[in-house]
């Protein structure tokens, strides 16, 4: 969490941003909130990016003002116009690119004063893993697959019954480059598994951590998966 204050003494407002991550090829959100104003026409929102000459986005007098927008963001940005009046200056970024990573500044002007806060935005690829029983293998085997990751993640298997066990000797992980030549498909196979035990396939890079769980019993297969973004710090 980054909380910034205006520099002009008593004419400062609090602006808050949250460090976040974008999944390349998908839409992302750069979060920013501020002390709201009564009149929309008195609010100016400017998004800037370190190292970029033009603006990322500008919103003033109740509408977008994109005449000074940098070429790399053309047609890809939007604020939540109906939420600006309640203090939401978050930016929606369409079709996130690797090059969108960096330090952004959310700069706000209202009738109460000015304020800004920086935001670290990471970009990469992350996806939910799916763990399935591999019927083609000669022994009891599980297969964990996740379609899109970047940078290359680590894959670790764990089990509820054998907590703390190292499964690296009985697992095999491969990374296959996807057609766009950036992201990779992750496939990990775990051998010699037993029933009535929950196995977890954990995939992690510096952007996200995802886990797929599976439990095989005589009567059913239970699956669960979840994904969490790392380093979501507010400023």
């Amino acid at each position: 969490l980054i909380i910034g204050f205006g520099i002009s003494g008593r004419h400062s407002i609090t602006v808050t941003t949250v460090a976040s991550a974008g999944n390349i090829g998908e839409d992302g959100i750069l979060s920013c909130t501020f002390e709201p104003d009564i009149k929309l026409s008195d609010i100016v929102i400017q998004w800037l990016k370190e190292g970029v000459l033009g603006l990322v986005h500008e919103f003033k007098e109740g509408k977008d003002e994109l005449s000074e927008q940098d070429e790399m963001f053309r047609g890809r940005t939007a604020v939540f116009a109906d939420q600006v009046i309640v203090g939401n200056a978050s930016l929606r970024l369409k079709n996130v690119q690797l090059t969108d990573a960096g330090t952004y500044k959310c700069y706000i002007i209202t009738s109460k004063g000015k304020g800004n806060a920086n935001l670290e935005y990471k970009t990469g690829a992350f996806s939910m893993p799916e763990v399935n029983v591999d019927y083609n293998a000669s022994s009891e085997t599980l297969r964990c697959e996740a379609p899109r990751w970047f940078p290359q993640p680590t894959v670790v298997w764990a089990s509820q019954v054998d907590q703390g066990a190292n499964f690296s000797e009985v697992s095999n992980t491969s990374f296959e480059l996807n057609s766009e030549n950036v992201t990779m498909k992750v496939v990990s196979v775990l051998y010699n598994v037993t029933i009535n035990n929950t196995y977890s396939c954990m995939i992690e890079n510096d952007i996200a951590k995802a886990t797929g769980d599976i439990k095989v019993t005589e009567s059913e297969i239970k699956r669960r998966s979840h994904l969490q973004l790392l380093n979501s710090k507010a400023s």
């Epitope: 029983v133 019927y135 009891e140 095989v216 019993t217 005589e218 009567s219 059913e220």
Partner: nanobody, 122 residues
């Protein structure tokens, strides 16, 4: 309550054929892989074959490959084992059982019918 009822066994000469049936009830048949397991009197149980819930995937123990065919009729909640080219070493009590996956360690199976005896002898 899970019920599995095997039938179709009998005495057959070497090289002969038999078709075993297993009628299942008490569970959602289409959720389960079905397996055939056999037990030679006085010996342990041995896995023979398996079939996936939709019938698209089958697998066999090496000694019966090319001679036995597993199939299922999901409308009738029944699994079959067609046996050709029977040999004396195929003599056993044949059981069908169910499991959530295609895994087939004998100790995983919990539900058993009464079995049907196949005797291959001249």
């Amino acid at each position: 309550e899970v019920q599995l009822v095997e039938s179709g066994g009998g005495l057959v000469q070497p090289g002969g054929s038999l078709r075993l049936s297993c009628a299942a009830s008490g569970f959602t048949f289409t959720d389960f892989w079905m397996h055939w397991v056999r037990q030679v009197p006085g010996k342990g149980r041995e896995w023979v074959s398996r079939i996936s819930p939709d019938g698209s995937s089958t697998s066999y123990e090496d000694s019966v490959k090319g001679r036995f065919t597993i199939s299922r009729d999901n409308a009738k909640n029944t699994v079959y084992l067609q046996m050709h080219g029977l040999r004396a070493e195929d003599t056993a009590v044949y059981y069908c059982t169910r499991f959530s996956t295609g895994w087939h360690r004998i100790e995983y199976f919990q539900h058993w019918g009464q079995g049907t005896l196949v005797t291959v002898s001249s």
